[in-house]
Amino acid sequence: APISSHCRLDKSNFQQPYITNRTFMLAKEASLADNNTDVRLIGEKLFHGVSMSERCYLMKQVLNFTLEEVLFPQSDRFQPYMQEVVPFLARLSNRLSTCHIEGDDLHIQRNVQKLKDTVKKLGESGEIKAIGELDLLFMSLRNACI
């Protein structure tokens, strides 16, 4: 299996009550505007065929996509939560900048691409769905990277 390096986040990142609460509030606010409840972006299909040791690298890819293609373009919405949560997630992304996999990561890229394609296919409602799943993104990063 590919070896992942520097794919770790300190537990303290997920133990800050204020920003944790704001992240979950943002997710809730966006999920109220999401009427496509049958589609799940973050869940079992995303992790299918990905070992536990590779999950943090996978989530780094999802986090970066969410920041660049979803949160930055939608940054004027869901205030005041967005202006606080985006810098928090950007800091996590920065801390994972040296997280790499030695070896083939095609199976990971394939799963991430499916998520990207789903978001793109749904258009703006796909972006809203991704924001509504920030609570799941938070949990996935926590479970995979600490």
């Epitope: 999920s31 049958d38 869940g43 079992e44 299918h48 609570d135």
Partner: antibody, heavy 119, light 107 residues
């Protein structure tokens, strides 16, 4: 409409096995998983485990490890729960419930299957 | 395993009352909590998910709140149809734990 329909009531002897089925309709079966929850007479709800309809992956409550097997058949959109080595305290109503896993709630429930274990 | 403790186990109330049921998790579960209503001989019904989101078809008199370890289910004005048993459930990654239940009776 979205529904889960379970198999009929069963009477089993101690030490026997029971296999309960749960047929799903009205939604894409492989987009969700199925959790199994049981309820002994006059008691509360007890979560037994979860099976993915997408991969067949399972996660069982520690109490039932080694005694329960949960499977799915995607061709018929049916989930199964087999419980072995039945004892009298396994007498309960067994429910299946739709559950994606990954922090999902149980939004659709079957009507329940009464399993009676008696000699 | 995360333990879920509900209180009270039995609650007597009258039509029109405001009723609150509490649920405590043995460790922090963020907002991953659901509430169910069950009537005798029937399957449970989802009322609230993610601690405070109202499930489809659930009456608006039901509301949920809480985050971390302490959660509440509130019925703003009790109706005859609300006398039932209520359960909280921790929504895990691929697992769940269910509280012992609160039986809501007519006073």
């Amino acid at each position: 409409q979205v529904q889960l329909v379970e198999s009929g009531a069963e009477v089993k002897k101690p030490g026997a096995s029971v296999k309960v089925s749960c047929k799903a309709s009205g939604y894409t079966f492989t987009s969700y998983g199925i959790s199994w929850v049981r309820q002994a007479p006059g008691q509360g709800l007890e979560w037994m485990g979860w099976v993915s309809a997408y991969t067949g992956n399972t996660n069982y409550a520690q109490k039932f490890q080694g005694r329960v097997t949960m499977t799915t058949d995607t061709s018929t959109s049916t989930a199964y729960m087999e419980l072995r080595g039945l004892r009298s305290d396994d007498t309960a109503v067994y429910y299946c419930a739709r559950d994606r896993g990954y922090y999902d709630a149980f939004d659709i429930w079957g009507q329940g299957t009464l399993v009676t274990v008696s000699s | 395993d995360i333990q879920m403790t509900q209180s009270p186990s039995t609650l007597s109330a009258s039509i029109g009352d405001r009723v609150t049921i509490t649920c405590r998790a043995s460790e922090g579960i963020y907002h991953w909590l659901a509430w169910y209503q069950q009537k005798p001989g029937k399957a449970p019904k989802l009322l609230i998910y993610k601690a405070s989101s109202l499930a489809s078809g659930a009456p608006s008199r039901f509301s949920g709140s809480g985050f971390g370890t302490d959660f509440t289910l509130t019925i703003s004005s009790l109706q005859p149809d609300d006398f039932a048993t209520y359960y909280c459930q921790q929504m895990g990654e691929y697992n769940a734990t269910i509280g012992g239940g609160t039986k809501l009776e007519i006073k």
